[in-house]
Amino acid sequence: VPLSRTVRCTCISISNQPVNPRSLEKLEIIPASQFCPRVEIIATMKKKGEKRCLNPESKAIKNLLKAVSKERSKRSP
């Protein structure tokens, strides 16, 4: 049975709160797909089990992504 092609994005709205990288547990980038036509960025925070949807177009978020990927590449051998 084929899956329903209903648009099912995870993010229903975007948070305008700034993200402190030290408060971040993980950052997930979900590419656009047949189920959701836009890129979604979901930050899992260390406290309160908070999942925060971030604006992929925001300069601050683009800088955050750069910082996180730089940190990751430092850690990998």
């Epitope: 229903i12 948070s15 709160q17 979901i42 406290k47 309160k48 089990g49 908070e50 999942k51 925060r52």
Partner: antibody, heavy 123, light 107 residues
Amino acid sequence: EVQLVQSGAEVKKPGESLKISCKGSGYNFPSYWIGWVRQMPGKGLEWMGVISPGDSDTRYSPSFQGQVTISADKSISTAYLQWSSLKASDTAMYYCARGYCSGGSCYPFFQYWGQGTLVTVSS
Amino acid sequence: AIQLTQSPSSLSASVGDRVTITCRASQGISSALAWYQQKPGKAPKLLIYDASSLESGVPSRFSGSGSGTDFTLTISSLQPEDFATYYCQQFDSFPHTFGGGTKVEIK
């Protein structure tokens, strides 16, 4: 209207497997945490674990880790709680519950609850 | 895991009474606390979240306060429909946990 509809009561024997379900409707299922809570007869609420259907992030209480599996199928807006080998001590009411979202952030405290599924394990 | 201790475990009160239930956390949880009401044979119902925010549709006689380790649920004037069991829950850090419950009975 937000609704969480749980599968019906189950009577099982020790050692049997079981999967109970919780179907969400009236909201965007992938966005919200879904949790499972146990209530043994005459006792209080016990937090078992939660799942975020959007990214499959799953967290368990140490008391339930390895004893149960929490999963979700976002294509049919349904969360599951399963056991591979039931014990008499698993006899309880099991509630699923949905988290809360506001301003682009979602949290796993429970704004809406299912009606509960009574699981009885007896030889 | 963070432990939540509710007190008292039960209390008897009359309609119109002011009722206070406390919840103490074994470590600081900021304001990440929710309160629920459960009536016999029913699912719990969210009353308060973030320690003091009243859930939509919940009567204003219910209020919550506190932060850090000490929290309070107050019912300003007890109504017949308020006789139930009340639970606190912390959602500051996993695993989230519930308090043991406080049963509010008719005097």
